[in-house]
């Protein structure tokens, strides 16, 4: 048992937040400031990511985990771990190779990122358009045209309100 343990890599005992220091006879040393090790048994600590410029700190670096960044207002994250910040557009627009462009008629975008999407086609579900779409909003589909035939009400009227202890007049 002793022989097996002596053959074992002494660095494997170093926990996250430390590194196996070859300069100090392979003892476990804490990661220096602004560095981290997220797993045990590491021979070096990694440098913490710095969130600068357009990048804001979402989570501070610790001895066991890297910093996490997001984007300043007016931009949104792209890529793994927010490696880039893409410019926002206004609602009703999409970002093209030439910049922010208004959504074409029949399409909408209700966010500051992403692409313009076609309005819902209400007739595919046998419904009618209750509220027209805009560049910023999808159409609102209502009941089917058959439900709106003369004499038919599309909305059930509410029951008359009664106060407790009073009979209807």
């Amino acid at each position: 048992f002793e022989r097996t343990r002596s053959l074992q890599d002494p660095c494997s005992n170093c926990p996250a937040g430390t590194f196996c220091d070859n300069n100090r006879n392979q003892i476990c040393s804490p990661c220096p400031p602004n560095s981290f090790s997220s797993a045990g048994g590491q021979r070096t600590c990694d440098i913490c990511r710095q969130c600068k410029g357009v990048f804001r700190t979402r989570k501070e670096c610790s001895s066991t985990s890297n910093a996490e960044c997001d984007c300043t207002p007016g931009f949104h994250c792209l890529g793994a771990g927010c490696s880039m910040c893409e410019q926002d557009c206004k609602q009703g627009q999409e970002l093209t190779k030439k910049g922010c462009k208004d959504c074409c008629f029949g399409t909408f975008n209700d966010q500051k990122r992403g692409i313009c999407r076609p309005w819902t086609n209400c007739s595919l579900d046998g419904k009618s358009v209750l509220v027209n779409g805009t560049k910023e909003r999808d159409v609102v589909c209502g009941p089917s045209p058959a439900d709106l035939s003369p004499g038919a009400s599309s909305v059930t009227p509410p029951a008359p309100a009664r106060e407790p202890g009073h009979s209807p007049q």
């Epitope: 931009f75 490696s83 910040c85 893409e86």
Partner: nanobody, 124 residues
Framework: QVQLVESGGGLVQPGGSLRLSCSAS????????MSWVRQAPGKGLEWVSD????????FYEDSVKGRFTISRDNAKNTLYLQMNSLKPEDTAVYYC?????????????????WGQGTQVTVSS
């Protein structure tokens, strides 16, 4: 092909000013964010400033805030760095760099094109 050519560097006394220029060609300049990065003698690359494609959003390294101003002229395909109140620690080679995606600001290790650099020396 993409080309970035810096100019405007030189020797200046502490407290003095310089204006760096970066002339861009070979891509649609007005669609890309641009940066200034510097490398002091014996040191690694240090991000200095970013400007978005339209020029309305600018960002600075803390040590240059209030002293340096990044700007761009999309009609002239040129990026600028106005450097005021220069200090000896601003001595470095200054590079302009292009970001990889349209209307997007990336981290320094993702920049896809760099100029050859211009030397700025601040000394009395």
């Amino acid at each position: 092909q993409v080309q970035l050519v810096e100019s405007g560097g030189g020797l200046v006394q502490p407290g003095g000013s310089l204006r760096l220029s970066c002339s861009a060609s070979g891509f649609t300049f007005s669609s890309y964010a641009m940066s200034w990065v510097r490398q002091a003698p014996g040191k690694g690359l240090e991000w200095v400033s970013d400007i978005n494609s339209g020029g309305e959003s600018t960002f600075y390294e803390d040590s240059v805030k209030g002293r340096f101003t990044i700007s761009r002229d999309n009609a002239k395909n040129t990026l600028y760095l106005q450097m005021n109140s220069l200090k000896p620690e601003d001595t470095a080679v200054y590079y302009c760099a292009k970001h990889p995606l349209t209307f997007t600001i990336a981290t320094m290790n993702d920049y896809d094109y760099w100029g050859q650099g211009t030397q700025v020396t601040v000394s009395s």
